[in-house]
């Protein structure tokens, strides 16, 4: 089959790095300066990405690979391959149109990015606050109320030991 | 514009070797793809070895192995070394720098 789809098609011999080129009658030809095909059987190359502004170049582009883009500190990437760089925040803070705003009481963050989620609501699963939220942190949840009642303890203390051949006075 | 010519052909039994050289002139310093093609009676003309501009060598899955692309900047020249050669070896060299070619250099492989 591979003899066959060569015969038919040149192009389908061209390896990663070159492009079918028309202009030479079909034969391959290596990819121009900053371009590159990362699959053979091309008929272009494509251009290389160029990780310029509050991108910052990761992997540089070869004539067989693209170049990969990260963010500049204090941003990270959102999207496929890092297609756009969003500002980070503090703990505690999220991204809206205006910036960075503090969580709103009753809601925390613990990362750089992303929104504030409400706190744990403990009581749903019948729990008790242990360790109260912050806006930065979550809720701890503790024991049910009625663990922590008055003779409610799930741990029974030992009785008291007596000496054997002793009978009580 | 570049002008390139070949040296270095010949007839060689199978198994040998031969190196290739493609001096170069004219400005060649802002030229950053070097190739060697060959064409087979018959055949249309194949990409070899070359040079990509992220300065690595590649070589077409035939002759990997055998064949070793180099160039030397200060003497303005580009080699290819052919070992172990094969009867389908046989072709006319052609040396290339983005848009200019040389005029080939035959190489016969033959017992």
């Known amino acids: 089959f591979e003899r066959t789809r060569s015969l038919q098609d040149p192009c389908s011999n061209c390896p990663a790095g070159t492009f079918c080129d028309n202009n030479r009658n079909q034969i391959c030809s290596p990819c121009p300066p900053n371009s590159f095909s990362s699959a053979g059987g091309q008929r272009t190359c494509d251009i290389c990405r160029q990780c310029k502004g509050v991108f910052r170049t990761r992997k540089e582009c070869s004539s067989t690979s693209n170049a990969e883009c990260d963010c500049t500190p204090g941003f990270h990437c959102l999207g496929a391959g890092c297609s756009m760089c969003e500002q980070d925040c503090k703990q505690g803070q999220e991204l809206t149109k205006k910036g960075c705003k503090d969580c709103c009481f009753g809601t925390f963050n613990d990362q750089k990015r992303g929104i504030c989620r409400p706190w744990t609501n403990c009581s749903l699963d019948g729990k008790s606050v242990l360790v109260n939220g912050t806006k930065e942190r979550d809720v701890v949840c503790g024991p049910s109320p009625a663990d922590l009642s008055p003779g409610a303890s799930s741990v029974t203390p030992p009785a008291p030991a007596r000496e054997p051949g002793h009978s009580p006075q | 514009a570049v002008q390139l010519v070949e040296s270095g052909g010949g007839l060689v039994q199978p198994g040998g070797s031969l190196r290739l050289s493609c001096a170069a002139s004219?400005?060649?310093?802002?030229?950053?793809?070097w190739s060697w093609y060959r064409q087979a009676p018959g055949k249309q003309r194949e990409l070899v070895a070359w040079?990509?501009?992220?300065?690595?060598?590649h070589y077409t899955d035939s002759v990997k192995g055998r064949f070793t692309i180099s160039r030397d900047n200060t003497k303005k020249t580009l080699y290819l070394q052919m070992n172990s050669l094969k009867l389908e070896d046989t072709a006319v060299y052609y040396c290339n720098s983005e848009d200019s070619w040389g005029q080939g250099t035959q190489v016969t492989v033959s017992s």
């Open positions: 004219g400005n060649i310093f802002s030229i950053r793809v």
């Open positions: 040079f990509a501009w992220d300065n690595i060598a």
